[in-house]
């Protein structure tokens, strides 16, 4: 970068290099060549020269002074007009940066997703920082006290193997940078209770000839938790609303579940699992699209049909069995 | 060699306006900044606008009495500066350089042209 | 802004004089300093740039000196084509600012 430029004096920024963006700064050029005594001096930023707000401090040294600055990132160097010289003569140069201090990250979760062997953990990190912004994941054990410490830019993976203090944890986040420091709040997990179980997948759909013609869903997980709940949700493509229906799922054998719907409409199916009475998800799958005939013939749609879609994570709190909508939306 | 040559000076009413064009020529337009100097009748020279040279990025510079009034511009293609005059008032008469400034100071001038704002 | 006076208003002379015009800026200006020469219904011209440093084609009885916040044009011997009106400029900080004029009439 513009900081290892062989210097002919020094660069250096009022209130910090990295400071709070928004504020006001000033960068000080202080030139030191050799039978130079500077006509002028010089700033560029991002290679553009700077034409306002330079002053004079000295016969060696100049201020460039910038209000409200709100850039990420400049590079910054400075020159030197010498008399007798044609070409200005560089000075130094310096990156500076411009950001925020960490929020105080939030909604932090842990999971396990089925055959990972690893717990994720996740949270809220607020606000862009727009500066290098390092978290620390503490993880301690609530049976024997050991603390292990994990540094990241975003999310952890904690391999499960390495969590040897039982199945009871502590987990906060810390957040720091240059401006900065935060710490979460504490989040108490049972190894137990955080598994998410594997995939569920929806593989086909056919609709069936009838006096009121069906259409079965065929989906299945390699889960092999046993009380498993699933949603599925589905909606006609031109619809905003989705209708969700609840099931007490054994994976044992591959699901069949079986919809009546409008004719000649193209349908979206999703399907979201979790370890019954637990507190975690699975994200819904990916979208699954079937079209229904128009009368009588057999339609049957395959898993190779998914088109890209935004799978969000909708809650629905319905009783098994029943159609609902639900009408939050994604 | 450089040349320099203004036009669109004239007669105006207050709180009308005026274009002035300065055409350039005989040096790379782009590489030097451009001015506008005023001078009113009698009186001394001011800078009234600038803008400046590529390595600058064109950064424009307006003194205080002509800020919201007056636009400068520059047409690389063309070769030529232009200084937009509106809500002209009777203290906006003078003659009106066209000025090429390399480092700051200036080293050449147009010939100038006259604005009267009067009615 | 940097504010710069110039002293005397007005001077006469005859030809042959040595002629001083005087500048002074409300700040040090580093040698940043021109002066301009300018007759009646003309644009001013360009003498000397960087407080002491002969513009080409300019004649060598002009000569310009000084440093910090004082500087001086000269001429060595006024000659009849020089009567006409001088203007300092700094162009030590953006934006540049000119002197009132010394203008140098017949005596």
């Known amino acids: 970068g513009i900081t290892n430029i062989n210097c002919s004096g020094h660069i250096w920024v009022e209130p910090a290099t990295i400071f709070k963006m928004g504020m006001n700064i000033s960068i000080y050029c202080q030139a030191a060549i050799k039978n130079c005594q500077p006509r002028k001096l010089h700033f560029y930023k991002n290679g553009i020269k700077e034409r306002f707000q330079i002053t004079r401090i000295n016969k060696t040294t100049a201020r460039l002074w910038y209000k409200n600055f709100l850039e990420p990132h400049a590079s910054m160097y400075c020159t030197a007009e010498c008399p007798k010289h044609f070409q200005e003569t560089l000075i130094c140069g310096k990156d500076i940066s411009s950001g925020y201090p960490p929020d105080i990250p939030d909604e932090v979760t842990c999971v396990i997703y089925e055959y990972s062997g690893n717990m994720t953990c996740t949270w809220n990190a607020g606000k862009l920082t727009y500066i290098d912004t390092k978290y620390v994941v503490h993880v301690k054990s609530l049976e024997t006290e050991e603390e292990q410490q994990y540094l990241t830019s975003s999310y952890i993976n904690i391999s499960t193997d390495s969590l040897q203090g039982g199945k009871k944890y502590l987990v906060w986040v810390q957040a720091a940078n240059a401006l900065g420091m935060e710490e979460s709040k504490q989040l108490q997990i049972h190894l137990d209770d955080i598994v998410i179980p594997s995939a569920a997948v929806i593989s086909r759909a056919e609709t069936i000839n009838a006096t009121v013609p069906k259409t079965i869903i065929y989906w299945d997980s390699q889960t092999t938790i046993e009380k498993v709940s699933c949603e599925m949700r589905y909606k006609a493509t031109t619809n905003q609303t989705w209708n969700v229906k609840e099931f007490d799922t054994n994976f044992t054998y591959v699901q069949q579940s079986e919809f009546y719907l409008e004719p000649n409409i193209k349908y979206v199916f999703q399907v979201r699992c979790q370890e019954t009475g637990k507190r975690y998800w699975q994200p819904w799958s990916s979208p699954f699209f079937h079209k229904t005939p128009e009368t009588v013939p057999q339609v049957t749609s395959k898993a190779f049909q998914h088109d890209t879609w935004n799978s969000g994570l909708t809650v629905a709190s319905i009783s098994t069995g029943h159609l609902t909508s639900d009408n939050r939306g994604d | 060699q450089v040349q320099l040559v203004e036009s669109g000076g004239g007669v105006v009413q207050p709180g009308r306006s005026l274009r002035l064009s300065c055409a350039a020529s005989?040096?790379?337009?782009?590489?030097?900044?451009m001015s506008w100097v005023r001078q009113a009748p009698g009186k001394g020279l001011d800078l009234v606008a600038d803008i400046n040279s590529k390595s600058y990025d064109y950064a424009t510079y307006y003194a205080d009495s002509v800020k919201d009034r007056f636009t400068i511009s520059r047409d690389n293609s063309k070769n030529t500066l232009y200084l937009q005059m509106n809500s002209l008032r009777a203290e906006d008469t003078a003659v009106y350089y066209c000025a090429v400034h390399h480092s700051d100071y200036f080293e050449y001038w147009g010939q100038g042209t006259l604005v009267t704002v009067s009615s | 802004d940097i504010q710069m006076t110039q002293s005397p208003s007005s001077l006469s002379a005859s030809v042959g004089d040595r002629v001083t015009i005087t500048c002074r800026a409300s700040?040090?200006?580093?040698?940043?300093l021109a002066w301009y020469q300018q007759k009646p219904g003309k644009a001013p011209k360009l003498l000397i740039y960087?407080?002491?440093s002969l513009q080409d084609g300019v004649p060598s009885r002009f000569s310009g000196s000084g440093s910090g916040t004082d500087y001086t044009l000269t001429i060595s011997s006024l000659q009849p084509e020089d009567f006409a009106t001088y203007y300092c400029?700094?162009?030590?900080?953006?934006?540049?600012?000119f002197g009132q004029g010394t203008k140098v009439e017949i005596k």
């Open positions: 960087h407080a002491s």
């Open positions: 005989g040096f790379d337009f782009n590489s030097y900044g």
């Open positions: 400029l700094q162009d030590s900080e953006y934006p540049p600012t």
């Open positions: 700040q040090d200006i580093y040698t940043n």
